[in-house]
Interface confidence: low
């Protein structure tokens, strides 16, 4: 079942998703989509990375972390009630049916008072590939022996410390972690 994350209207929402490249630069394609993860790919793609870069993104959707180190957590800027719903983070591991799929439920609450649209304090550039703020690591590891030996050591959906402290009380921690190889 999906983990639930919350934000208020006008704030930035944060949906954590991590994998750890076995080595720098050895990236795995990732897609984010609106709606639960389908059998293949992502539906209603809002952002996509390839082996080197963020190659597709839509307005208001950003990677605010070090995606080159596997922090592919999604930030949705200035959310509205329409942003509520399930989001899919899909780590597209090479091989047949090897993808890791994470469904994250975003609940948008009406603002107590209507705030002016705000940006997170570390929102430092106009393009996601230039944003390099770090997160922190997973809480536990679960070993899987049946996956292929690829250059990828860990995948996790972990509620990292938020860059935006206003959301901190609304975020529920998740410790789902997968180690490969």
């Amino acid at each position: 079942s999906e983990v639930e994350y919350r934000a208020e209207v006008g704030q930035n929402a944060y949906l954590p998703c991590f994998y750890t490249p076995a080595a720098p630069g050895n990236l795995v394609p990732v897609c984010w989509g609106k709606g639960a993860c389908p059998v293949f790919e992502c539906g209603n793609v809002v952002l996509r990375t390839d082996e080197r870069d963020v190659n597709y993104w839509t307005s208001r959707y950003w990677l605010n972390g070090d995606f080159r180190k596997g922090d592919v957590s999604l930030t949705i800027e200035n959310v509205t009630l329409a942003d509520s719903g399930i989001y899919c983070c899909r780590i597209q591991i090479p091989g047949i049916m090897n993808d890791e799929k994470f469904n994250l439920k975003l609940v948008i609450k009406p603002a107590k008072v209507t705030p002016a649209p705000t940006r997170q304090r570390d929102f430092t550039a106009a393009f996601p590939r230039m944003l390099t703020t770090r997160g922190h690591g997973p809480a536990e590891t679960q070993t899987l022996g049946s996956l292929p030996d690829i250059n990828l050591t860990q995948i996790s959906t972990l509620a990292n410390e938020l860059r935006d402290s206003r959301l901190a009380n609304d975020l529920r921690d998740s410790g789902a972690t997968i180690r490969i190889g």
Epitope: G25, N26, K69, T132, H136, T141
Partner: antibody
Framework: EVQLQQSGPVLVKPGTSVKMSCKAS????????LNWVKQSHGKSLEWIGV????????TYNPKFKGKATLTVDKSSSTAYMELNSLTSEDSAVYYC??????????????????WGQGTSVTVSS | DVVLTQSPATLSVTPGDSVSLSCRAS??????LHWYQQKSHESPRLLIK???QSISGIPSRFSGSGSGTDFTLSINSVETEDFGMYFC??????????FGGGTKLEIK
């Protein structure tokens, strides 16, 4: 000031194991990958492997798979390398070295900007 | 594996000379080539990263150039403190960083 302080020299017998340490200071330990590099006497450098202190993820040079095991202790900002089944071929100086934290879509590789002072391992009966 | 060949193996120079050290890769490594200096009984020190990018604290007389398979480290007006070993390293090929065999810069 960034520093990597390695444990002292060791003399060990063939067939045994040794575990050396690399204590990091002066930066956020989990923000940089840590490499281990071997330098045999009078020879060039060999990359052993890299560990991500963020979560313990590792990648090894195939030559050193099964020979070296890399771990970290985040609470003490210390990285460790254990070498097993030691032979005279393992006699060398071993360095830990921090990856340059450099992000730009033009580059995929990393350099090593800070190095420990090295740990000398001598394997002899 | 990517093999890095450094030449010459030994370079004898007089302080004040300008020198070039070569590093050739067995296949293209883009700009993922780095240079290190190692003095006797010391740890390696990063001089140049990504072919030509300078490193804070490294004298400006050190510079790098090249791309693909052929790379050069240049030292403009060698000083006595520059003598030692120089290694190139590639980080384009995973899961293996590789180093060149080294060039020894010695006083003539």
């Amino acid at each position: 000031e960034v520093q990597l302080q390695q444990s002292g020299p060791v003399l060990v017998k063939p067939g045994t194991s040794v575990k050396m340490s690399c204590k990091a200071s002066g930066y956020t330990f989990t923000d940089y990958y840590l490499n281990w590099v071997k330098q045999s006497h009078g020879k060039s450098l060999e990359w052993i492997g890299v560990i991500n202190p963020y979560n313990g993820g590792t990648t090894y040079n195939p030559k050193f798979k099964g020979k070296a095991t890399l771990t970290v202790d985040k609470s003490s900002s210390t990285a460790y390398m254990e070498l097993n089944s030691l032979t005279s071929e393992d006699s060398a100086v071993y360095y830990c070295a921090r990856d340059v934290d450099y992000f730009d879509n033009k580059y995929v590789g990393y350099a090593m900007d800070y190095w420990g002072q090295g740990t000398s391992v001598t394997v002899s009966s | 594996d990517v093999v890095l060949t450094q030449s010459p193996a030994t370079l004898s120079v007089t302080p004040g000379d300008s020198v070039s050290l070569s590093c050739r890769a067995s296949q293209s490594i883009s700009n993922n080539l780095h240079w290190y200096q190692q003095k006797s009984h010391e740890s390696p020190r990063l001089l140049i990263k990504y072919t030509s990018q300078s490193i804070s604290g490294i004298p400006s007389r050190f510079s790098g150039s090249g791309s693909g398979t052929d790379f050069t480290l240049s030292i403009n007006s060698v000083e006595t403190e520059d003598f030692g070993m120089y290694f190139c390293q590639q980080s384009n090929s995973w899961p293996q960083y590789t180093f060149g065999g080294g060039t020894k810069l010695e006083i003539k």
